[in-house]
Amino acid sequence: QGGTRSPRCDCAGDFHKKIGLFCCRGCPAGHYLKAPCTEPCGNSTCLVCPQDTFLAWENHHNSECARCQACDEQASQVALENCSAVADTRCGCKPGWFVECQVSQCVSSSPFYCQPCLDCGALHRHTRLLCSRRDTDCGTCLPGFYEHGDGCVSCPTSTLGSCPERCAAVCGWRQMF
């Protein structure tokens, strides 16, 4: 039946979708649909997403690109990756800050704010887990400090000060009277 060189295309497949009259090739990521194809299995007219907009996937029906999100400065967020035609801005926290989710069931798209990480050194404690997705986990007192209440107290520098049992164990002093 007529030596046709035309490609067969399946409207139900992933490659072509019915847009308007015909099954059309979709637009690649980073492009939006300006006009559908004008023949069966043809190429749609696709244009690159304008600045500050993006489309992350191949698409058949998007006639406009999505606006890039702005990181929330009020929540101390910063852009870890700038928006491109194919990917949205990736917001996060600057070094020394961690993500505190604003909802209980936290997922990647959940609203969040950035909190400064605990500085274990300033608390005279060992850093057990570095701060990234959650706050720093501080460990035991640094050498030359002992546990007293909630904090770490420095070992006395002379025998004149008092040195309780925990102090004595860490600092090597006996309580002097």
Partner: antibody, heavy 123, light 111 residues
Framework: QVQLQQSGGGLVQPGGSLRLSCAAS????????MSWVRQAPGKGLEWVAT????????YFPDSVKDRFTISRDNARNSLYLQMNSLRAEDTAVYYC????????????????WGRGTLVTVSS | DVVMTQSPDSLAVSLGERATINCRAS??????????MQWYQQKPGQPPKLLIY???NVESGVPDRFSGSGSGTDFTLTISSLQAEDVVVYYC?????????FGGGTKVEIK
């Protein structure tokens, strides 16, 4: 039976506007692509516009693009052609037609036509 | 655009004789083994009427004296035995790609 009743033609000055209507009956209007075809006095047929079923994408030849718009109201079983910036060369009988799709080949033929409405563009 | 060229512009045939109208497309109008072209008949003061679709399929209600043939770029409409009511204008049209284009028409007359 399938019927396409046209209205809206008339005399208009160059640069003017006109809206043609086509009322459909006897078939499920929303399931068909629809077209407008024109015929200048004593001349042949020229395709003017098509609107798809479902997603209502519209298509035009370069001769009318940016001047004409095609639209449909599926609730009212009606097809429209809005013609702006009319020129003397737009003078013609305008026909609305139903586009029937044949099989899975994405192939359309105009199987039913309205009786036509005359548009005259003259000063 | 796909240019459709009809020949002849007019054709004089005796009643009861065969009439043959040709249509040539500037490029192939085939898709998936089907010729996306059709023939219309237009009587004076009336809209066109679909006679043949997909090059050779006769539309329902059309007398069987009408037939279509051809593929690729060359197509023919044949009226096997011309009747008085067939003495009108015939147009070919392609639907392979937009813009849809028509031939210039062939006027059939009685010899």
């Amino acid at each position: 039976q399938v019927q396409l009743q046209q209205s809206g033609g008339g005399l208009v000055q160059p640069g003017g506007s006109l809206r043609l209507s086509c009322a459909a009956s006897g078939f499920t209007f929303s399931s068909y692509a629809m077209s407008w075809v024109r015929q200048a006095p004593g001349k042949g047929l020229e395709w003017v516009a098509t609107i798809s079923d479902g997603d209502s994408y519209s298509y035009f030849p370069d001769s009318v693009k940016d001047r004409f718009t095609i639209s449909r109201d599926n609730a009212r079983n009606s097809l429209y052609l809005q013609m702006n910036s009319l020129r003397a060369e737009d003078t013609a009988v305008y026909y609305c037609a139903r586009d029937r799709i044949y099989g899975s080949v994405q192939y359309y033929a105009m199987d039913y036509w309205g009786r036509g409405t005359l548009v005259t563009v003259s000063s | 655009d796909v240019v459709m060229t009809q020949s002849p512009d007019s054709l004089a045939v005796s009643l009861g004789e065969r009439a043959t109208i040709n249509c040539r497309a500037s490029e192939s109008v085939e898709f998936s083994g089907t010729s996306l072209m059709q023939w219309y008949q237009q009587k004076p003061g009336q809209p066109p009427k679909l006679l043949i679709y997909a090059a050779s399929n006769v539309e329902s209600g059309v007398p069987d004296r009408f037939s279509g043939s051809g593929s690729g770029t060359d197509f023919t409409l044949t009226i096997s035995s011309l009747q008085a009511e067939d003495v009108v204008v015939y147009y070919c049209q392609q639907s392979r790609k937009l813009p849809y284009t028509f031939g210039g028409g062939t006027k059939v007359e009685i010899k």
